[in-house]
């Protein structure tokens, strides 16, 4: 549900990845959105750490703008999704080893990743930065 | 595995068309755009054009404007490229590709077309 | 229309050499390049994503730099089986273009 309000990033775990001063999209089906967002962050994070050194900063910037999405100000806050080809690439060429571990044990009910069910866009349903360049941020 | 199988290949005379095919799978066909790129005997790299299997959405290399036509058809998971108007300068190997630049790039095994009168 | 222009067009070069491939965008694509590799009668296989990033199971003697207008793949130490023609790729904006290619020979 995309109901919320745009304001300024206050948080800690995404300082280094989003612009200075960025405008995020805050969701109010979250009783306190600033809060619950920041932990969502806060636990797929804390599973980056044990990810390659290639993957590590791609899924970071990719975790940060999908769970705090720049935000269009205007009589209807509107989040602005990642572009599709930024996803692609984490999850293909940045992280594809990791990828494929996550789908796995997720798929044999190893471990429920926070990563992979609360925090990973489907690429494919994304904006293209190429057909709609507007409709999509770019990382 | 993902696998992408072309159709076989073709003799044409010029000022003709000709429609190549490209058979997708192992992976969510609207999932992912197809490029259509083309390699002339001797020649380099020539990119033609891509579509989003996922609707149908297309953008064209200005040099093939008009002319080529990609499509989709989701109930069997194929791509086609059909170029008109064919000249001998159109003699080449085609190849589809998948995502060329973003995601795992995966390439079918080309088809040659040859224009010849 | 982004121009690539790549250069040289061909070069011979001896196993062990280090290679030098440039690739120029006649307007800023970031480090949206990809490279290639295509040996006669294969198709291409990329070797490098994002300007710099490694492909999956190619060898670590090549590496690609390089943002905005001018980029590079470097071969430290060549092997017999790199004999071959690589291509750069600009996917920053449709229409994708490629450079016209270096075909790499035995010196």
């Known amino acids: 549900d995309n109901k919320g309000y745009c304001a300024q990033y206050r948080g800690e775990v995404c300082n280094a990845v989003l612009a200075k001063d960025a405008l995020v999209f805050l969701n109010t089906s979250y009783a306190d959105p600033e809060e619950a967002q920041e932990l969502l962050v806060h636990t797929a994070w804390n599973e980056l750490k044990v990810v390659s050194p290639v993957c590590r900063p791609a899924a970071e910037a990719l975790l940060c703008n999908h769970i705090f999405q720049e935000c269009s100000p205007g009589v209807v806050p509107t989040p602005i999704p990642i572009c599709r080809e930024y996803c692609l690439a984490v999850k293909e060429l940045f992280c594809a080893k990791e990828w494929l571990v996550m789908e796995e044990k997720t798929h044999r009910g190893l471990y429920r990743s926070e990563m992979h069910l609360l925090s990973v866009p489907e690429c494919s349903k994304l904006p293209s930065m190429h057909w709609d360049p507007t409709a999509c941020a770019r990382l | 595995q993902v696998q992408l199988v072309q159709s076989g290949a073709e003799v044409k005379k010029p000022g003709a068309s000709v429609k190549v095919s490209c058979k997708a799978s192992?992976?969510?066909?609207?999932?992912?755009?197809m490029h259509w790129v083309r390699q002339a005997p001797g020649q380099g790299l020539e990119w033609m054009g891509i579509?989003?299997?996922?609707?149908?959405?297309?953008s064209y290399a200005q040099k093939f404007q008009g002319r080529v036509s990609m499509t989709s058809d989701t109930s069997t998971s194929t791509v086609s490229m059909e170029l008109s108007s064919l000249r001998s300068e159109d003699t080449a190997i085609y190849y589809c590709?998948?995502?060329?630049?973003?995601?795992?790039?995966?390439w079918g095994q080309g088809t040659l077309v040859t224009v010849s009168s | 229309d982004i121009q690539m222009t790549q250069s040289p067009s061909a070069m011979s070069a001896s196993v062990g050499d280090r290679v030098t491939i440039t690739c120029r965008a006649s307007?800023?694509?970031?480090?949206?390049l990809a490279w290639f590799q295509q040996k006669p009668g294969k198709v291409p296989k990329r070797l490098i994503y994002?300007?710099?990033n490694l492909q999956s199971g190619v060898p670590s003697r090549f590496s690609g730099s390089g943002s905005g207008t001018e980029f590079t793949l470097t071969i430290s130490s060549l092997q017999p089986e790199d004999f071959a023609t690589y291509y750069c790729l600009q996917h920053n904006s449709y229409p994708y273009t490629f450079g016209q290619g270096t075909k790499l020979e035995i010196k």
């Open positions: 590709a998948r995502e060329l630049g973003w995601g795992s790039d995966y």
């Open positions: 192992g992976y969510t066909f609207t999932s992912y755009y």
């Open positions: 307007q800023d694509i970031r480090n949206y």
């Open positions: 994002i300007a710099s």
């Open positions: 579509i989003n299997p996922s609707g149908g959405s297309t």
